[in-house]
Each structure stands twice: as C-alpha cells, then as structure tokens.
C-alpha cells in the first residue's frame, strides 16, 4: 500500500485494529513506557469460577504465534508537512510476559525527542496494543524504513516497514567548486543534486545564460572547453517539486602576478641589506620564487643588474656580497606557473662603512731605555672611501717570557701615527701588531713586529716592518 | 575594487570623531593604505599611511591630532580634538607601492591608485 | 618638510590644443623620479594619471605625458578634451622622510 499525503488524515480515522469495540475505552502510555503489560485484573473480567490461563514453558510452545497488524507500507508527503502512523498488535491472554513497543528507524532504535504513544485496549480475550508515531514538519532527515519491535514471551517480534519518503525540491550533494584555470584550458564541473522525487534534472548556466539546451540526468559533469576569461557558473536542478540553483562559482583566469606593494629595508651592513616584500595578487596561482634586482645607484657604474633568486616565502632575502658605504636600487619580482611579474618600483638602499681592508704600513718599534717606554710608529694605510673615515688605531703588544705571558691593547686616535707605551716586563719579547678602525670596524692587524726586552742594560733591537704594497690607491 | 569612507558629520570642536575606510576586492594585508584631506576649495593635504603590517606614518603637522588603526576589512582615522581647520572632506587611498625603512622608522609612497568617494567632516561650534 | 609647487594656474587652451604644467620641488624627489600626477574633477576623488614621473596608469590615454627628474617635472596634455578639464596635482615623496607632499593644484581650463 502507498499512502499519498491527501490521504494522511485517514490514517487513524477508521476503526481500530482487530476486534476492538469502538466505544471501548483505552488507556495510554507514551512510548519511553518500557514496562510490562497491566497485569490481567485491570480491565478484564474473568468468571469466578475461571482461572486466568498459566503458560508453562513447555505450553509456550504451543501458543498461536503473534504478529503484528498489517499497516500502511509507504507514506510519500513533502517537506514541512506532518506525519502519523502506526503499528498495532493483539496480545491474547495466553502470553504473560510482554514488554512494551519500541520504534526503530533504518536499523536504529528511537529514543527521546521523538512523539510517539502507545495505547491499550484490553478486553476478556486478551489486549490490542497500538503505538502511535508523529513527526511534524517532515524533514529530508526523516526519510527511511521505520518499524516497531516489541518481546512477547522472551521472543521478539518485529514489524512490517512503512517506508517514509520525504519529497521536495532537488537538494544538492555536490555542487560545482571555485577552481583557477589556464586560459584556453579544458575543465571539468560537478553538480549533483537528489530527490525524492526522482529523477533530478541538470542544466548548467554560464554567466547567466544556460549552457545545455537538454537537461541532464544528475549527477551531471560539464566540460568547459576553456576561458578567456573569468566566468561564473552554477547549475539548476530541475524535479517534479521543481528547481533548486547551486551557489555561483568563479572559475578565474590564472594570469601572471601583480608586483610585491611593498618593500622594506629591515638592516643593512657594510656587506649585505636585509629586504622584506609584500607580495601583490598572486594572480590565482600559488608564487613559487621571487627574485631580488641589485644594481649600483651610482650613475658612474655599469649598471650591470645582480640578480638574487629565493623561494617565494618567507617574503624576506639578505643581499650579500655587497661593496660598504654604496648605493643600491633595488627590485622585487616574484613569480607563478603563468610567469614573472612587473618588477617592484626600485629603491634606494646603502650599505654602511666597511672596515678598513689594509693594515698600517712601515711599523717600527724602538726602546726608549731612559724612559723605560717602547715607542712605535707606523704610516697611515690606504684606507679606500667605502672603508670609512679612520677613526684611529689599534696597537697590539704581547710580553713573553719564562714563565710570564701577557697581551695588552692600547686604542689611539687618528691623528697620530706613533705612540708610546711603557715596559710591562724586562728579559722578555714584546711582539706589536696594528690595526686601523673606522666607523665600520676594525681592520686587519700587520705582521708582528718583535723587540727584545733586556734585563735593564743592552737593547738587542730587532728592527723589522711591513713593506708598503706597489699599489695604494685609494 | 573599491574604498569607501563612512562617518564623516557635523561635530563640534573637541569631540573626537572617527571615520572608516572600508575596502572590497583586496586584502588590507597586502596593501598600504592612507589618508588625504581636502578642505572646502583648497588642495589636496597628506595625513598619513598605515602599512600592510600595521605600521603607522603621519605627516608631520599631523602627528599627535589624528590616529590610525585598521582590522582586517577597514581602516579607521580617528581625528582626536577637531578643530574647524580640519572641516574638510577626508578620502581613503589604497597606496599602490610603499617602500619602509624600518630602522630609520620612515616609508615612503610611490603612488595612491585607488580612491574613495570621501566622507565630509564639518567641524564647528 | 618639502614643498611642491606647481604654475602656472589656471592654464586655459581651446579643443584639440596643448597645455603644460610644471612641478618643481623644493629638493630631489626619491630616487629622483617618484613624481606621480593626479587629475581632479569637481565633485570626484582625485584619479591616479601618472607614477615614476613619466609611467601612464592603466587606463589612461598617451594623449598625457609626464617628464622630468629630480626636482623638476612637467605633464603635458595634448590634443585637449572637454573631459579633461579639470586641477592637475603633482605629488611625491622625499629620502629620509615619510611626508607625502601634494603641490598646490594647477586648474586646465578647456575653450
């Protein structure tokens, strides 16, 4: 049987079930009642001279088998209405040990917010049970096989199904995704949708317009032969309840990147600028690398173009290799699979004074007895404009002897090219180095220059110094 | 893509007002973006830039008198004590390139390349 | 701060003509070309024409044209529309500042 909703108000408006008198009162429980049957006293009336029959286990067995009623197999109604139905029973007085009814639904048992009542009517031959079931306002969720089950001396007894199909319009399981294409590329859309009622219909719409003249059968697959540009799309699906649109999606051209919007000049050193970018649009496709431009703002230079490669995150690369005190443009582009991009406005960066890269020249050391002093002296080393300014030196003296070690440093100012420091210990070496400093550092020290230290008389001076280089160009 | 202002009104000096720049099409976390001012028949004045980062850059006769802030979608310039030489009609601009130093504490603008509407703010008594 | 100014205003020139507006400033540009133009029509928001002094913006016809370096710029619009009636803006940014100085305007006036 298949009830269709016009009918629904039927369900319970003819007579009850089996051999129930119409005047007959009932009693009710709601369902979560798990309690045995009234016991045989309520509602029934037996003569005095009448036992009420004992079932032995042996005599169970010869109890006439119970089932439940024959009810409604299938109710079709649309969403939002609401649904009743019903399983019945009659249980003669033979059976003793009954439960109550429970509801299940596609295998699973219903409890809790669920309406259901159960009723009884007990007469002299035994009682007629009836579980009510309702829903209101009948969702997709309510679709399925519901039954009843309930223990009838240690045996369980199931329903038939009656079978709840919930219609209304088409309801999607699978709508189409935004994707990022190539230009002229094929691509595929999804769109599935379902009832009931069957069957549901597809048409796919681009831009507004239909794509397929004939609707097809869902789930449906479009192939878009490829863009030119970026299009919206979403499909309709079409049932006898009527028509359901997916949300639109955006199929994007992928296209090259647009340049980083910002740039930033985090450190620099006398060798090396720390950048940081942030990256444009990536133009719907993932950016794989980003490339640094480096070339000399000096407009005497070349103008040759360094060319820096680095993964596209962390958005962030240190420029080495660079000459101290000059000045950089510098541009970022990055790239994705379509290709580079602009390259960034350039800026300006500068990296700071470097250490002086030579040593001073021509040093000589002398022991000043009289005054017990090492006086020492030394030229000025070409020091080249990105060194820096000198800002003086730094005199290096270490004092060996038996036993004894000791290495002390002394800083002087640019002015001078000499200075003088006192004898730390007699009957020693004193081995001087020298270096320059500048604002960027401190430069390479000279080769040592060794003096021996009498006791308190004779000087064995080792005269030594460093040869000025051929070329001092600055 | 598109910017526009919002809360520009009738104030009276002193109360504090805040306008905010709203933006569709793009990321606030991509782009910089600044405010300019306009007063009645006058030139076009610089008030300030908020980086992709957050970072804030004012003008200098502006520092102090207003402050900028943003979330994700919005960026606000809240004008703390109005005089009536700030009647004017204010505009949000996305700020095409910008080039920080982040150890001198300074950035600089390449070019504003989307406008807004503007939002007119009256200041007076 | 740095200052830009503009001359002369207004410039006036007939339908299918040629005017030219200087930008002069105060001290070098950054990077001695980060010079853009603005154009401005009553009741609008000023719309991007020219960046990097001479670099059209998308959109925007090759009838104007930006030039110069430094401290000196000019846009020169030719073959003159109605439409273009409008105040021109020079704007730019200085090393070792954050101000963004906007020039005082130049106001074509189209006969």
């Known amino acids: 049987e298949k009830w269709e909703e016009t009918e629904l108000d039927q369900l319970f408006s003819g007579p009850l079930p089996g051999r129930l008198p119409v005047n007959h009162r009932p009693f009710s429980a709601p369902h979560s009642s798990r309690d045995q049957l009234p016991p045989p006293q309520t509602g029934r009336s037996h003569p005095a001279h009448t036992a009420a029959p004992q079932v032995t286990s042996t005599a169970s067995k010869l109890l006439p088998p119970v089932a439940f009623n024959h009810t409604i197999g299938h109710i079709v109604l649309s969403e939002h209405k609401n649904v009743k139905f019903n399983c019945s029973i009659n249980i003669p007085n033979t059976y003793q040990e009954t439960a109550g009814i429970s509801w299940w639904k596609d295998g699973k048992e219903l409890l809790g917010a669920h309406h259901s009542i159960t009723q009884f009517y007990p007469d002299e031959e035994g009682v007629s049970i009836i579980a009510l079931f309702s829903i209101a306002s009948v969702q997709r969720s309510d679709n399925g096989s519901y039954f009843c089950k309930m223990k009838v001396n240690n045996r369980e007894i199931v329903s038939d199904p009656i079978y709840v199909e919930v219609q209304g319009l088409p309801y999607f399981i699978k709508q189409p995704e935004s994707v990022n294409v190539t230009r002229n590329t094929a691509f595929n859309l999804t769109c599935q949708a379902v009832g009931p009622p069957e069957p549901v219909n597809i048409f796919w719409v681009q831009n507004s317009s239909r794509v397929n003249e004939k609707p097809e059968r869902s789930p449906s697959v479009l192939t878009v032969p490829g863009l030119t540009e970026t299009a919206v799309f979403s499909c309709e699906a079409h049932n006898d309840k009527g028509l359901t649109v997916s949300k639109g999606v955006h199929i994007n051209i992928k296209v090259i990147p647009s340049p980083p919007t910002e740039v930033h000049i985090l450190n620099s050193t006398a060798h090396s600028i720390l950048v940081s970018w942030v990256p444009g649009f990536d133009g719907y496709s993932p950016l794989q690398n980003c490339s640094i431009q480096v070339k000399e703002a000096d407009r005497l230079s070349n103008g040759s173009v360094m060319v820096f490669n680095t993964s596209a995150s962390p958005h962030l690369y240190e420029i080495q290799q660079l000459q101290a005190l000059a000045n950089y443009s510098i541009a970022v582009s990055c790239r994705n699979e379509i290709g580079w991009s602009a390259v960034s406005p350039w800026i300006l960066a500068s990296t700071t004074e470097g250490a002086p890269s030579v040593a001073p020249l021509n040093i000589t050391v002398f022991l000043n007895e009289s005054n017990n002093i090492l006086d020492i002296r030394w030229t000025k080393p070409p020091i080249k404009r990105q060194d820096g300014e000198l800002v003086g030196y730094r005199i290096s003296h270490v004092w060996e002897s038996a036993g004894t070690y000791k290495e002390l440093s002394e800083e002087v100012s640019q002015n001078g090219s000499w200075a003088q420091i006192p004898v730390q210990i007699h009957n020693a070496t004193c081995t001087v180095r020298i270096a320059a400093i500048t604002k960027g550092g401190i430069g390479p020290f000279s080769e040592p220059v060794n003096i021996i230290i009498p006791e308190h008389s004779k000087v064995d001076y080792a005269p030594s110094s460093t040869p000025a280089p051929g070329n001092t160009d600055s | 893509q598109s910017v526009e202002e919002s809360g520009g009104r009738l104030v009276t000096p002193g109360t504090p007002l805040t306008l905010t720049c709203t933006v569709s099409?793009?990321?606030?976390?991509?782009?910089?973006m600044s405010w300019v001012r306009q007063a009645p028949g006058k030139g076009l004045e610089w008030i300030g830039i908020i980086s992709s980062s957050g970072s804030t850059y004012s003008a200098s006769w502006a520092k102090g008198r207003f402050t900028i802030s943003k979330t994700s979608t919005t960026m606000d310039l809240k004008i703390t004590s109005p005089t009536t030489e700030d009647t004017a009609t204010y505009f949000c601009?996305?700020?095409?390139?910008?080039?920080?130093?982040?150890?001198?504490?300074?950035?600089?603008?390449?070019?504003?390349?989307?406008w807004g509407q503007g939002t007119l703010v009256t200041v007076s008594s | 701060a740095a200052v830009l100014t503009q001359t002369p205003s207004p410039v006036s020139a007939a339908v299918g003509g040629t005017v030219s507006i200087s930008c002069q400033s105060s001290k070098s540009i950054y990077n001695n070309n980060w010079l853009s133009w603005y154009q401005q029509k009553p009741g609008q928001p000023p719309k991007l024409l020219i960046y990097d002094a001479s670099d059209l913006a998308s959109g925007v016809p090759s009838r104007f044209e930006g030039s110069g370096s430094g401290t000196e710029f000019t846009l020169t619009i030719s073959d003159l529309e109605c439409d273009d009636a409008a105040t021109y803006y020079c704007?730019?940014?200085?090393?070792?500042?954050?101000?963004?100085?906007f020039g005082g305007g130049t106001e074509v006036v189209v006969k």
């Open positions: 099409g793009f990321s606030l976390s991509s782009n910089a």
């Open positions: 601009a996305r700020v095409g390139f910008f080039v920080g130093y982040g150890a001198y504490d300074y950035g600089i603008i390449h070019r504003l390349d989307l």
């Open positions: 704007a730019g940014g200085y090393s070792g500042d954050s101000d963004y100085a």
